[in-house]
């Protein structure tokens, strides 16, 4: 025998208190699939979270982070403070990248400058706190007496924007 609840579409639930008829999800709840016996409570984007997509009867709300913060975790389960380019977030707050490392985003860690010689290349543009080096041709490709290293391009905001 077919379960009468299987006829209930997304956005409704199978109401046991009313002879298993399909009732619409109450306000601030949703069901994203058919045949549900309950509707799920909508996520609320509060505090440092802000609403990216409103809850509907068939889909949950989606949150992102207020300016100055960025999402972490599946479905933006956490918001983490932005730092400036050339910095990384530590337990003590935003700290400048150490020499030889860079961060060209407002999130994430300071990474070592690329080792161009790993690929047999030379350094074309020096690295900074905010920018990786730019690798150039292999030293053998350079004409004699030609200087390969260009000073770094000046760092500018916004640089790599947080995603």
């Amino acid at each position: 025998l077919q379960d009468p609840c299987s006829n209930c579409p997304a956005g409704t639930f199978c109401d046991n208190n009313r002879n298993q008829i399909c009732s619409p999800c109450p306000p601030n709840s949703f069901s994203s699939a058919g045949g549900q016996r309950t509707c799920d409570i909508c996520r609320q984007c509060k505090g440092v979270f802000r609403t990216r997509k409103e809850c509907s009867s068939t889909s949950n709300a989606e949150c992102d982070c207020t300016p100055g913060f960025h999402c972490l975790g599946a479905g933006c389960s956490m918001c983490e403070q932005d730092c400036k380019q050339g910095q990384e977030l530590t337990k003590k707050g935003c700290k400048d990248c150490c020499f030889g490392t860079f961060n060209d985003q407002k999130r994430g860690i300071c990474r070592p400058w690329t080792n161009c010689s790993l690929d047999g290349k030379s350094v074309l543009v020096n690295g900074t706190k905010e920018r990786d080096v730019v690798c150039g041709p292999s030293p053998a490709d350079l004409s004699p007496g030609a200087s390969s290293v260009t000073p770094p391009a000046p760092a500018r905001e916004p640089g790599h924007s947080p995603q």
Partner: antibody, heavy 119, light 107 residues
Framework: QVQLVQSGAEVKKPGASVKVSCKAS????????INWVRQAPGQGLEWAGN????????NYNQKFKDKATITADKSTSTAYMELSSLRSEDTAVYYC????????????WGQGTTVTVSS | DIQMTQSPSSLSASVGDRVTITCQAS??????LNWYQQKPDKTVKLLIY???RARSGVPSRFSGSGSGTDFTFTISSLQPEDIATYFC?????????FGQGTKLEIK
């Protein structure tokens, strides 16, 4: 020499998912960013996101954030892009690329994987 | 996102002609501008990186110039094997963005 070899063409139904692979060889896989780029039929190139295989740190184009999941397997030197809830608009050639020695340019490109979404 | 406006969208030229393609960024991208060649078989190759630098093995007829927001790609003497679509791409700011492409044909 540096090579990126992608998985073969896929035909999928709307609503399905697909996982495209990109096997790297000829270099240290963990030391370079892998990017994914989409090209819809008759259209230009669109950057979807990238991954640094050493620590699996990812960046996404906001447009692809709910569509694509980029991962990397260090043990097999393979990067993946999984596309979910496929729609006809996702029909495209998907390329993986490797950076030139810093993230700012893409020096090596895979041959491309055609994903066709059709009912 | 940074918009990259590339022109022309297509052009037809004769073997030996000088061909110029331009790319304009919607904001300053310093020198983080790259040029790619996509052949009819869909293979893609980086030709020029960091505005002016040709990859080793790229013929000297290909060159790039510019800085800030305005960039130019030049083929000094067009060859039959240069039939392709050419794309500019900015690597300054995420998300990386491409120009719409210039389809080059031989007259």
């Amino acid at each position: 020499q540096v090579q990126l070899v992608q998985s073969g063409a896929e035909v999928k139904k709307p609503g399905a998912s697909v996982k495209v692979s990109c096997k790297a060889s000829g270099y240290t896989f963990t030391s370079y960013w892998i990017n994914w780029v989409r090209q819809a039929p008759g259209q230009g190139l669109e950057w979807a996101g990238n991954i640094y295989p050493s620590d699996s740190y990812t960046n996404y184009n906001q447009k692809f954030k709910d569509k694509a999941t980029i991962t990397a397997d260090k043990s097999t030197s393979t990067a993946y892009m999984e596309l979910s809830s496929l729609r006809s608009e996702d029909t495209a050639v998907y390329y993986c690329t490797r950076d030139y020695g810093s993230a700012y340019s893409m020096s090596t490109w895979g041959q491309g994987t055609t994903v066709t979404v059709s009912s | 996102d940074i918009q990259m406006t590339q022109s022309p969208s297509s052009l037809s030229a004769s073997v030996g002609d000088r061909v110029t393609i331009t790319c304009q960024a919607s904001q300053d991208i310093s020198n983080y501008l790259n040029w790619y060649q996509q052949k009819p078989d869909k293979t893609v190759k980086l030709l020029i990186y960091y505005t002016t630098r040709a990859r080793s093995g790229v013929p000297s007829r290909f060159s790039g110039s510019g800085s800030g927001t305005d960039f130019t790609f030049t083929i000094s003497s067009l060859q039959p094997e240069d039939i392709a679509t050419y794309f500019c791409q900015q690597g300054d700011t995420l998300p990386y963005t491409f120009g719409q492409g210039t389809k080059l044909e031989i007259k």
